[in-house]
C-alpha cells in the first residue's frame, strides 16, 4: 500500500478579515484507518479547529464531502476570518484507537489576515 | 496505458475564437482533475487552466481569465478549452495533463496541439 | 516565482542536482522535456514520488523552500530541459527550466 503523504499545497494564505479562508490539505492514502484533524499553532498550545469525527465547529466547513469513505480531500474553509486566527495551521492525520494517536502532519499553511478593505 | 490525445488546434486571426479537445483513456476520467498547460515558441511550460474531477470549479491563469472556458464530458471522456479573443501572444503548444492527486502535480501529458494567432 | 538556475551540465556517468527554490508551495514536481514542443514528462511528482516508468536514477528531495532533483548516473539521453514545479497555483505552478548538457 502507497505510504500516506499529506500534501498542504501552500505555505501561505493571505484574506482580507471578514472573508473566508480555504486551506487546502489532501492525503495520499486511505490507511491508516483514522480521522483528520486540523489545528491552529503546533505542540501543547496548539488550538483545535476541525475534528472529522466530532463538532459542530460552527466557522468551519470542509470543502469536499469528507463522509465519503474513499474521500481525500479534507480542505477547509473557516468563514469571517479576524485578526485571531492569524497563525500556522496544520492538517494532520489520526491513526484510530482508543485514544486516537498522531500519525502524520503537514507541513503547514500560514494564515495572515489583511485589514478590511474599506 | 495512459493516453491523452489533443485536437483542435489551427490557424486563426487575433480576436477569434478555437475550441481544443482533449480525449483521454487508460484511466478513470471522471476521478481526476485535468489541466491545460501550453508553451510558447522558445518558452517554458505556462499553466492555463484546471478543472475539478465533476467539472464544477475551474482555475484560470491571470493571462487567460475570461477569454478561455475549461469544460469536460466525463460520459465521453473528454476536456476542452474554449478559447475566445485569442491574441498573438496565445501562439502556443497546447498540452492536456492528467493531475495526480493534489491537481498542480500532473503525471501524466498529451503531445500537444499548435495553436497559432496571427494576422 | 520558481528559480531555477538557467543550465548546468554533468560528465557521463557522473551525478548533478539541479535546485529549486522560492514560491509559496510546500511541495514541487520535476518535468522533463527533451527538446521544445515534445510532451514533457514527469519524473517526480509531490516531492519524491517517481512515477513507474521512470528510472530510479531519478530522484527528488525538498528542504524548506528548496527542492531538488538528483540524477545518479547521468545518460546522454537525460540532456533536456528540466522543469519545477509549485504546489500553489500562486506561483504560476512553473519554474523558467534548467537545461542539462551531459558532457
Known amino acids: 500500500e502507497e505510504e500516506l503523504q499529506i500534501i498542504q499545497p501552500d505555505k501561505s494564505v493571505s484574506v482580507a478579515a471578514g472573508e473566508s479562508a480555504i486551506l487546502h490539505c489532501t492525503i495520499t492514502s486511505l490507511f491508516p484507518v483514522g480521522p483528520i484533524q486540523w489545528f491552529r499553532g503546533a505542540g501543547p498550545a496548539r488550538v483545535l479547529i476541525y475534528n472529522q469525527r466530532q463538532g459542530p465547529f460552527p466557522r468551519v466547513t470542509t470543502v469536499s464531502e469528507t463522509t465519503k469513505r474513499e474521500n481525500m480531500d479534507f480542505s477547509i474553509s473557516i468563514s469571517n476570518i479576524t485578526p485571531a486566527d492569524a497563525g500556522t495551521y496544520y492538517c494532520i492525520k489520526f491513526r484510530k484507537g482508543s485514544p486516537d494517536t498522531e500519525f502524520k502532519s503537514g507541513a503547514g499553511t500560514e494564515l495572515s489576515v489583511r485589514a478590511k478593505p474599506s | 496505458d495512459v493516453q491523452l490525445v489533443e485536437s483542435g488546434g489551427g490557424v486563426v486571426r487575433p480576436g477569434e475564437s478555437l475550441r481544443l479537445s482533449c480525449e483521454a483513456s487508460?484511466?478513470?476520467?471522471?476521478?481526476?482533475?485535468m489541466t491545460w498547460v501550453r508553451q510558447a515558441p522558445g518558452e517554458g511550460l505556462e499553466w492555463v487552466s484546471t478543472i475539478s474531477d465533476t467539472g464544477d470549479t475551474a482555475y484560470y491563469a491571470d493571462s487567460v481569465k475570461g477569454r478561455f472556458t475549461i469544460s469536460r464530458d466525463n460520459s465521453k471522456n473528454s476536456l476542452y478549452l474554449q478559447m475566445n479573443s485569442l491574441r498573438a501572444d496565445d501562439t502556443a503548444i497546447y498540452y492536456c495533463?492528467?493531475?495526480?492527486?493534489?491537481?498542480?502535480?500532473?503525471?501524466?501529458w498529451g503531445l500537444g496541439t499548435l495553436v497559432t494567432v496571427s494576422s | 516565482a520558481l528559480t531555477q538556475p538557467a543550465s548546468v551540465s554533468a560528465n557521463l556517468g557522473g551525478t548533478v542536482e539541479i535546485t529549486c527554490s522560492g514560491g509559496n508551495s510546500n511541495h514541487y514536481g520535476w518535468y522533463q522535456q527533451k527538446s521544445p514542443g515534445s510532451a514533457p514528462v514527469t519524473l517526480i511528482?509531490?516531492?519524491?514520488n517517481r512515477p513507474s516508468n521512470i528510472p530510479s536514477r531519478f530522484s527528488g528531495s525538498t528542504s524548506g523552500s528548496t527542492t531538488t532533483l538528483t540524477i545518479t548516473g547521468v545518460q546522454a539521453e537525460d540532456e533536456a530541459v528540466y522543469y519545477c514545479?509549485?504546489?500553489?497555483?500562486?506561483?504560476?505552478?512553473f519554474g523558467a527550466g534548467t537545461t542539462l548538457t551531459v558532457l
Open positions: 487508460g484511466f478513470t476520467f471522471r476521478n481526476y482533475y
Open positions: 514545479g509549485g504546489s500553489s497555483t500562486g506561483d504560476g505552478i
Open positions: 495533463a492528467k493531475s495526480w492527486i493534489w491537481w498542480t502535480f500532473f503525471d501524466y
Open positions: 511528482y509531490a516531492d519524491t
